[in-house]
């Protein structure tokens, strides 16, 4: 049997070697013109796929195989020319130098060439199946695209429309956003940058202390001068006093000493009849030393010893130990009545605390203990609280149990640092705790995210400075 | 855009007082605070009060209190600075802004073009 | 109230050069800070805010840096419309402004 064989010479073209008996014969066959080879990476099912196309991706996969088509084609053409032209010469050939068995083969090798031919036409109308397949899937797309297109450009203008609309509500909401996250990053910034500065302040103004406790003794030297000047002072005073009496007296024998009415506290002065608030003359406990003090004849059945006052930022309440100890201020605006006096005063009998707190909204609240008293200056006046009720948290707001008093030069806290100094302000600082009433006063708009202010935390949180506080102190018994 | 528009220049005599506009535009007039700048030729810059267009609520500086009022007209988006008892020293450019903050107190970010006030007997 | 001092109070510079510009604040002021640029005739211009942050169609050759007392304004390259007058303000502790700093051609 004839034995038929394909390959490639060293120049890239097809050969078809046809081998029958002795005799062995060699068609050189024409290569397609930029087409693919079978390496390519061109599949022919590829053009099968039920996946949508990207429309960019199908129109160029279409050109690619109207190129093949056409270059399929015209090496057909090619084909069927050559073929035919060497089949005249062969045949002429054959007739005039071979036998008629040799006819025979040549016939043979036609008939296996046109089979080919045969074969590559049919799988060429397989693939212009194929394609004509894939354009219809194509146009079936690009009209769905379409469909779809049209549909999602009337859907954009109907959000563009909507979105023009939310765009002036979302301009003003976008600005509130980034201000406030702006204020956010600053805000964590500046609490670090704070903590910083703080550690460097506190260095500072340890050295400051050592030069102050200098001047301190100096001033404490200077004032047992005084005191005694004084003591020697108010005996005089005493002595003339006796003998304007005695030579009153004497004078006039009918006329009665007057009785001198003094009042301990604010309750005294209600029960006395004085029933308007005001600033009162009170004395201090087992003495004759007066302090003044504002009265609350008014709320919650009056009575009320005003002990603090925080309103308006008018008063600068970073005093000295001395200061926090005898009173500072206005009764009638900001103050601080005095430690010594409360101390005194609250160790007599039981007295209740009201601390009355006002924020910057609108809002009140209030903390009440049932039993107050503040220990005496050997232990810091150190405070004692018991029995919490009230609205403006449920958890003390003044660290329990109670701390000694601080001051920025008198520091009594639990603290590495020096509360008083970092914070500003005397107050019962723990470490440093959550509460100073007695911090720097800050206005509206400027009162949050401010580690000194005027701080409840129970109430208002770590970093809200309020508006107005008022601490007042009534006899239990009222 | 945002806009402040302030009332023109005022010519006054000292112990009188004078009122000073400031028309907003371009945002909501109740939003933000605004503030009042005043200004010295050749000097630097003073603050002295503010108001909050939604409440009426006024916070002065301390060396201004009880000589200037603010207030405000919410239908015409409009804050005013009333300054009373004029001296020769009240004779600088003031300035309305608009303070940027929301919830707390931020930086200028719109200016009016100013309003020159002159107080000479 | 808080204290705002800037310096140098002129500054001579060329253009392309850079400027570096200082405010000091008598107390901590977090990052409460801002800068203004005043030309003549014209109302202040917010430049830089929360010490660093620029505000809305500032060129970013203006760069400002720090926190609690000391804050620095730069311009990286001055071009000609940057010579001006410049402010610092705090807003941490009621609102107080520096005097000012005068950028003029060398």
């Known amino acids: 049997y004839n034995n038929f064989r394909k390959s490639m010479d060293s120049i890239g073209k097809k050969q078809y070697q046809v081998q029958h008996g002795s005799c062995s014969y060699t068609f050189l066959l024409p290569e397609m013109d930029n087409c693919r080879s079978s390496s390519s990476p061109y599949v022919s099912n590829a053009v099968q796929r039920d996946a949508p196309l990207e429309y960019d991706d199908s129109v160029q996969r279409l050109q690619v195989l109207e190129n093949i088509m056409e270059n399929n084609t015209q090496w057909l053409m090619k084909l069927e020319n050559y073929i035919q032209d060497n089949m005249k010469k062969e045949m002429v050939e054959i007739q005039q130098n071979a036998v008629q068995n040799q006819t025979a083969v040549m016939i043979e090798i036609g008939t296996n060439l046109l089979n080919q031919t045969a074969e590559q036409t049919r799988k060429l109308t397989d693939v212009e199946a194929q394609v004509l397949n894939q354009t219809t899937r194509l146009e079936l797309q690009l009209l769905e695209h379409s469909l779809s297109t049209n549909k999602l450009e009337k859907q954009i203008l109907d959000q563009t429309s909507e979105i023009n609309k939310l765009q002036d509500k979302n301009s003003f909401l976008e600005k509130k956003v980034l201000a406030m996250e702006d204020k956010h990053i600053i805000q964590l910034q500046s609490i670090k940058e704070e903590k910083d500065q703080l550690q460097v302040l506190v260095s500072k103004q340890n050295s400051i202390i050592e030069e102050l406790e200098k001047k301190i003794v100096t001033a404490t030297v200077n004032n047992s001068v005084l005191q005694k000047q004084q003591h020697d002072l108010m005996e005089t005073v005493n002595n003339l006093l006796t003998m304007m009496s005695t030579s009153n007296s004497a004078k006039d024998p009918t006329v009665a000493k007057e009785e001198q009415i003094s009042f301990r506290d604010c309750a005294e002065v209600f029960k006395s009849g004085h029933t308007t608030n005001g600033i009162y003359t009170l004395t201090f406990p087992n003495s004759t030393e007066e302090i003044k003090a504002y009265c609350d004849m008014e709320a919650g059945g009056g009575g009320w010893t005003i002990i603090q006052r925080r309103e308006d930022g008018s008063v600068d309440f970073q005093r000295t130990w001395k200061e926090y100890k005898v009173g500072f201020g206005n009764p009638s605006g900001e103050y601080w009545l005095g430690n010594e006096f409360v101390s005194q005063l609250t160790n007599q009998q039981r007295y209740v605390l009201k601390i009355h707190l006002k924020d910057w909204e609108g809002n009140e609240a209030y903390s009440l203990y049932e039993h107050f008293y503040l220990s005496s200056e050997e232990l810091n006046y150190r405070i004692h609280l018991k029995g919490l009720t009230g609205t403006a948290g449920k958890i003390s707001s003044i660290s329990q149990p109670g701390n000694d008093f601080s001051t920025k030069d008198g520091d009594n806290d639990k603290c590495i640092c020096k509360c008083s100094q970092m914070l500003t302000g005397g107050w019962w600082f723990d470490a440093c705790g959550p509460s100073n009433l007695n911090g720097m006063y800050y206005p509206q708009r400027q009162n949050t995210n401010k580690f000194n202010g005027i701080k409840w935390y129970y109430w208002k949180g770590s970093g809200y400075s309020l508006k107005a506080t008022t601490m007042m102190i009534r006899p239990a018994d009222f | 855009q945002v806009q402040l528009v302030q009332s023109g220049a005022e010519v006054t005599k000292p112990g009188a007082s004078v009122k000073v506009s400031c028309k907003a535009s371009g945002y909501t007039f109740t939003a933000y605070h605004m503030y009042w700048v005043r200004q010295a030729p050749g000097q630097g810059l003073e603050w002295m009060g503010w108001?909050?267009?939604?409440?009426?609520?006024?916070n002065y500086a301390q060396k201004f209190q009880g000589r200037v009022t603010m207030t405000r007209d919410t239908s015409i988006s409009t804050a005013y600075m009333e300054l009373s008892r004029l001296r020769s020293d009240d004779s600088p450019v003031y300035y309305c802004?608009?303070?940027?903050?929301?919830?707390?107190?931020?930086?200028?970010?719109?200016w009016g073009q100013g309003t020159l006030v002159t107080v000479s007997s | 109230e808080i204290v705002m001092t800037q310096s140098p109070a002129t500054l001579s510079v060329s253009p392309g050069d850079r400027a570096t510009l200082s405010c000091r604040a008598s107390?901590?002021?977090?990052?409460?800070f801002a800068w203004y640029q005043q030309k003549p005739g014209q109302a202040p211009r917010l430049l830089i805010y929360?010490?660093?942050t620029r505000a809305t169609g500032i060129p970013a050759r203006f760069s400002g840096s720090g926190s609690g007392t000391e804050f620095t304004l730069t311009i990286s390259s001055l071009q000609s419309e940057d010579f001006a007058v410049y402010y610092c303000q705090q807003y941490h502790y009621w609102w107080t402004f520096g005097q000012g700093t005068k950028v003029e051609f060398k």
């Open positions: 802004a608009r303070d940027q903050g929301i919830a707390a107190a931020g930086p200028f970010d719109y």
């Open positions: 107390q901590s002021v977090s990052s409460n």
């Open positions: 929360g010490s660093s």
């Open positions: 108001i909050n267009p939604n409440s009426g609520g006024t």
